[in-house]
Interface confidence: medium
C-alpha cells in the first residue's frame, strides 16, 4: 500500500482535517463504482441534544436528534437526520429534519474495491464507525475524496447491506465466521448486531444476572457464588468441593458389608428378614442409626455445611425467585432433604418405641436421592457444566435418539419373540420380556443374559445390532458438535465474564485470575448527548440504554449502585 494511504491509519493533523475539496470524480479501478460527490470538509459531528428536549410537532423546541452535524470531509453530522454525536431518536419520534440528512454520495474503498452509497444510508447508525462522522474521518483520503479501509473485501457487501437494510446482518457464505465477527467489531456495528449475527450462526445468547444492591450482601454473594472473586471465595469453593466429595464417599462406604446398616440393606429379600429388620439391632452396626455413629456424625457435619451454604446464598442472593428456579439450587435442596427425612423418621421411631415410621422402599428411595449431591460438583466443575450445557442444547437430538431406540425396541423385540416362539428353550417368553434384549442389542452392549437360539432369532438379532449402530449414530455428531462449541467457548477465553453495571453501574470485569472492580471507561461519543424539554418540565425521553459489553447485554434499570449486574456465565474452578 502506498505511503499516502498508510497515513490514513492515524487521524489527519488539524490542518488537514477541514480542507475543502471541489467535487471530483476519482479514477475508478476495474469494475469499481465511481463517485459523484460534493466533497466539503465538515465540522466535527455535533452532539445530540441535551436530555431535556422532546419534539412536539409545531413546538419551538429543539429535537433531540437534530443536533449539530458535522464530521469528516465529504459528509456532515447530518444534523437533521440524526447522524450526529447524539443518540438517535427512538422509533416513536421521527426525525423532523430527516430530509436534510445527507443526500450526497460517498465512496468507500475497501482494499481497492470501491463502494458507493448515500450518507443518509450510513446516518441511520450514528454509533457505528461509518455512521459517526468523527470516527470515519480518520480513514478519509482527501486526494481521492474517499474513505479507504484496508479490510476484508467480501465482508463489506454484508456490512453495507447492514446499513441499507436498516440493521440486518448476514454473513457472506465465503467469509469465515471469525473473520466476519472481526469485521463487525472493526466497523463498530455494536453488540446488538454481534448478538444477531451470533444467534443466526447458532451461538447461544448469554444472559446477565444482577448482583445484590447492598454492599455486604454483594460481598457475601460473591464469596459463595463466584470462586474467582477473591482468595476467601476460592477457599469456600474448595471447602465446598471437599465436603461434597466426603459426603459421596460416606454414601458409598456405608454400604460396605462391614459398615452396612441391616435395617436399610437386609441380607436377604425374604419376608422374614424384612419383618425382622424393623427392630433389628444385629450385624456389625448394632444401632447403626444411633446419633453417635461415625457415619451419621460425618453426614451431619456435611449437611450442616450444605444447609449453611444454601441459606447464606439464599439470603444474599439478589432475586429470591430466580434463586428458587435455578436447577443448581434445587439440586442443593435435594441433597439435604433425605438427611432431614431420615432424621425425622429416626426420631419418630424412637418416640414410637422402635416401630418403623416409614416403609423401607420409600426410605431406600430417599437415601438413593442422596447420590444426587454429586451434581453439586457441577457448580465448581467446568467439565460438568459443559456436559450439562451440551445435554440441554442437544435435547432435540437426544429425543430423536430415544425415539429411534423406541421404534427399534418395539420392532425387534416383536420380531425376536415370534422368531423364537417355537423354541421351548428360548428365554423370550413375551414381547415385553424381549424389550431388555432389544435395548442391550441396539446399543451394542450385548450382555448375553438373553440371546436368540434359532436361526431366525439370530438374523433378527443381527439386524437389531446393525439398526442400533446406524440409528444411534445419527444424532451423535450434533451432540458432539454442541459439546465442542461449549468446550471451546470455555477454553478459548470466553469464560471472562463481565460484571457490569448498566447506566450508572460501573463495569466490573472478571478474568480467570480475579474479579476486579474497574471504573467504567467506555469511550462515549458525543452522539449520545440526549435531552428533553417540554413545557418547562425536564424528563428523560428515552428508556434506559443498556451498556453492551463483551458478547452480552445487561440492563439494570432497577437500581443505581455500582456492580449491579453480572454475566450469568460464572467463573469455574477447573476440574
Amino acid at each position: 500500500m502506498d505511503e499516502r494511504l498508510s497515513l490514513l491509519r492515524s487521524p489527519p493533523p488539524p490542518s488537514a482535517r477541514h480542507r475543502a475539496h471541489p467535487p471530483q470524480r476519482p479514477a475508478s479501478s476495474g469494475g469499481a463504482h465511481t463517485l459523484v460527490n460534493h466533497g466539503y470538509a465538515e465540522p466535527a459531528a455535533g452532539r445530540e441534544l441535551p436530555p431535556d428536549m422532546t419534539v412536539v410537532p409545531g413546538d419551538h423546541l429543539l429535537e433531540p436528534e437534530v443536533a449539530d452535524g458535522g464530521g469528516a470531509p465529504p459528509q456532515g453530522g447530518c444534523g437533521g437526520g440524526g447522524c450526529d454525536r447524539y443518540e438517535p431518536l427512538p422509533p416513536s419520534l421521527p426525525a423532523a429534519g430527516e430530509q436534510d440528512c445527507c443526500g450526497e454520495r460517498v465512496v468507500i474503498n475497501i482494499s481497492g474495491l470501491r463502494f458507493e452509497t448515500q450518507l443518509k444510508t450510513l446516518c441511520q447508525f450514528p454509533e457505528t464507525l461509518l455512521g459517526d462522522p468523527k470516527r470515519r474521518m480518520r480513514y478519509f483520503d482527501p486526494l481521492r475524496n474517499e474513505y479507504f479501509f484496508d479490510r476484508n473485501r467480501p465482508s463489506f457487501d454484508a456490512i453495507l447491506y447492514y446499513y441499507q437494510s436498516g440493521g440486518r446482518i448476514r454473513r457472506p457464505v465465503n467469509v469465515p465466521i471469525d473473520i466476519f465477527s472481526e469485521e463487525i467489531r472493526f466497523y463498530q456495528l455494536g453488540e446488538e448486531a454481534m448478538e444477531k449475527f451470533r444467534e443466526d450462526e447458532g451461538f447461544l445468547r448469554e444472559e446477565e444476572r444482577p448482583l445484590p444492591r447492598r454492599d455486604f450482601q454483594r460481598q457475601v454473594w460473591l464469596l459463595f457464588e463466584y470462586p474467582e472473586s477473591s482468595g476467601p471465595a476460592r477457599g469456600i469453593a474448595i471447602v465446598s468441593v471437599l465436603v461434597i466429595l466426603i459426603s459421596i464417599v460416606i454414601f458409598c462406604l456405608e454400604t460396605l458389608p462391614e459398615f452396612r446398616d441391616e435395617k436399610d440393606y437386609p441380607a436377604s429379600t425374604s419376608q422374614d428378614s424384612f419383618e425382622a429388620a424393623g427392630n433389628s439391632t444385629s450385624g456389625s452396626r448394632a444401632g447403626a442409626s444411633s446419633f453417635s455413629d461415625p457415619f451419621f456424625v460425618v453426614e451431619t457435619l456435611c449437611i450442616i455445611w450444605f444447609s449453611f451454604e444454601l441459606l447464606v446464598r439464599f439470603f444474599a442472593c439478589p432475586s429470591k425467585a430466580t434463586f428458587s428456579r435455578n436447577i443448581m439450587n434445587l439440586i442443593d435442596i435435594v441433597a439435604i432433604i433425605p438427611y432431614f427425612i431420615t432424621l425425622g423418621t429416626e426420631l419418630a421411631e424412637r418416640q414410637g418405641n422402635g416401630q418403623q415410621a416409614m416403609s423401607l422402599a420409600i426410605l431406600r428411595v430417599i437415601r438413593l436421592v442422596r447420590v444426587f449431591r454429586i451434581f453439586k460438583l457441577s457448580r465448581h466443575s467446568k467439565g460438568l457444566q459443559i456436559l450439562g450445557q451440551t445435554l440441554k442444547a442437544s435435547m432435540r437430538e437426544l429425543g430423536l435418539l430415544i425415539f429411534f431406540l423406541f421404534i427399534g425396541v418395539i420392532l425387534f423385540s416383536s420380531a425376536v419373540y415370534f422368531a423364537e416362539a417355537d423354541d421351548p428353550t428360548s428365554g423370550f417368553s413375551s414381547i415385553p420380556d424381549a424389550f431388555w434384549w432389544a435395548v442391550v442389542t441396539m446399543t451394542t452392549v450385548g450382555y448375553g443374559d438373553m440371546h436368540p437360539v434359532t436361526i431366525g432369532g439370530k438374523i433378527v438379532g443381527s439386524l437389531c445390532a446393525i439398526a442400533g449402530v446406524l440409528t444411534i449414530a445419527l444424532p451423535v455428531p450434533v451432540i458432539v458438535s454442541n459439546f465442542n462449541y461449549f468446550y471451546h467457548r470455555e477454553t478459548e477465553g470466553e469464560e471472562q465474564s463481565q460484571y457490569m453495571h448498566v447506566g450508572s453501574c460501573q463495569h466490573l470485569s472478571s478474568s480467570a485470575e480475579e474479579l476486579r472492580k474497574a471504573r467504567s471507561n467506555s469511550t462515549l461519543s458525543k452522539s449520545e448527548y440526549m435531552v428533553i424539554e417540554e413545557g418547562g418540565m425536564n424528563h428523560s425521553a428515552f428508556p434506559q440504554t443498556p451498556f453492551k459489553t463483551g458478547n452480552s447485554t445487561a440492563t439494570c434499570t432497577t437500581n443505581n449502585n455500582p456492580n449491579s449486574c453480572v454475566n450469568i456465565k460464572k467463573i469455574f474452578t477447573d476440574v
Epitope: 428536549m53 429535537e63 437534530v66 453530522g77 437533521g80 429534519g97 436534510d100 447506566g503 462515549l524 448527548y529
Partner: antibody, heavy 116, light 113 residues
C-alpha cells in the same frame, strides 16, 4: 476549512433592532445544527439561541424569548439572528457556532452595542 | 436554570506543572437515559474565540492534546492539564449541556509563569 463569518453588528439604541448574519463555508451547512452564543467583554459566555438543520425547530434563552428570532437559509448557507427590542444588557460579541449544545466551531464574532 | 460555578477564578502555573480547574453545577447534569454527564469544557486564548476541548465531562474532542483531560460526575467536574505548556495560557470555561439555557461557568484564567 470551516469558516463562520458574522456580520450585521453595530451600535443601536435601546428598543432598536439589528439583524445578524453568519456566512458559513467549508462544511455542509444544511445538515448542521447551529447556534448563537454571546460574550460581553469581561463577562461570561452566554448561549442565546439554537436552530436545527432544517430550520423548523428553534430554542432561545428566556431573556431573549419573544425578542430574538433565529433562522437560516440553507441555499445561501447563512444563519440569521433577528434582534428586536434590544436592551443594554444585550451588548456583547455575538458568535455564530456549529452545534446545538456543544460548539465545535466558532466565528470571530460581531459586536453589538445597545446604548443611548 | 442550572448555574455553573468555576474555581479558582485564576491560576498561575509553570511550564510542565499540573493544573486542575473545578466546575460545580447547581444540579445534576447526568442524563437518566444514558447516565452520561452533559458537561463541556472550552479554551479561549486571548483575542480568539473559544474552542471545544472536552465533552461528556471526559471525552476529548478530536485534535485536542492528551494533556487535557476531564473527570467528574453528577455536579462536580474537573479539567486537568497534566503538563502545562506556554500555549495553554487562556481562559477555560465549563458549560452544562443538560438543559436550556446551556449556561457557561464564569471562566478560569490560566497564566504561565
Amino acid at each position: 476549512q470551516v469558516q463562520l463569518q458574522e456580520s450585521g453588528g453595530g451600535l443601536v439604541q435601546p428598543g432598536g433592532s439589528l439583524r445578524l448574519s453568519c456566512a458559513a463555508s467549508g462544511f455542509t451547512f444544511s445538515i448542521n445544527g447551529m447556534s448563537w452564543v454571546r460574550q460581553a467583554p469581561g463577562k461570561e459566555v452566554e448561549w442565546v439561541s439554537s436552530i436545527n438543520s432544517g430550520g423548523e425547530i428553534t430554542n432561545y434563552r428566556d431573556s431573549v424569548k419573544g425578542r430574538f428570532t433565529i433562522s437560516r437559509d440553507n441555499v445561501k448557507n447563512t444563519l440569521y439572528l433577528q434582534m428586536n427590542s434590544l436592551k443594554p444588557e444585550d451588548t456583547a460579541f455575538y458568535h455564530c457556532v456549529t452545534g446545538i449544545v456543544a460548539y465545535d466551531y466558532w466565528g470571530q464574532g460581531t459586536q453589538v452595542t445597545v446604548s443611548s | 436554570d442550572i448555574q455553573m460555578t468555576q474555581s479558582p477564578s485564576s491560576v498561575t502555573a509553570s511550564v510542565g506543572e499540573k493544573v486542575t480547574i473545578n466546575c460545580k453545577s447547581s444540579q445534576s447534569v447526568v442524563s437518566a437515559s444514558n447516565q452520561k454527564s452533559y458537561l463541556n469544557w472550552y479554551q479561549q486564548r486571548p483575542g480568539q474565540s473559544p474552542r471545544l476541548l472536552i465533552y461528556y465531562a471526559s471525552t476529548q474532542e478530536l485534535g485536542i492534546p492528551d494533556r487535557f483531560s476531564g473527570s467528574g460526575s453528577t455536579t462536580d467536574f474537573t479539567l486537568t492539564i497534566s503538563s502545562v505548556q506556554p500555549e495553554d495560557a487562556a481562559v477555560y470555561y465549563c458549560q452544562q449541556a443538560y438543559s436550556a439555557p446551556y449556561n457557561f461557568g464564569s471562566g478560569t484564567r490560566l497564566e504561565i509563569k
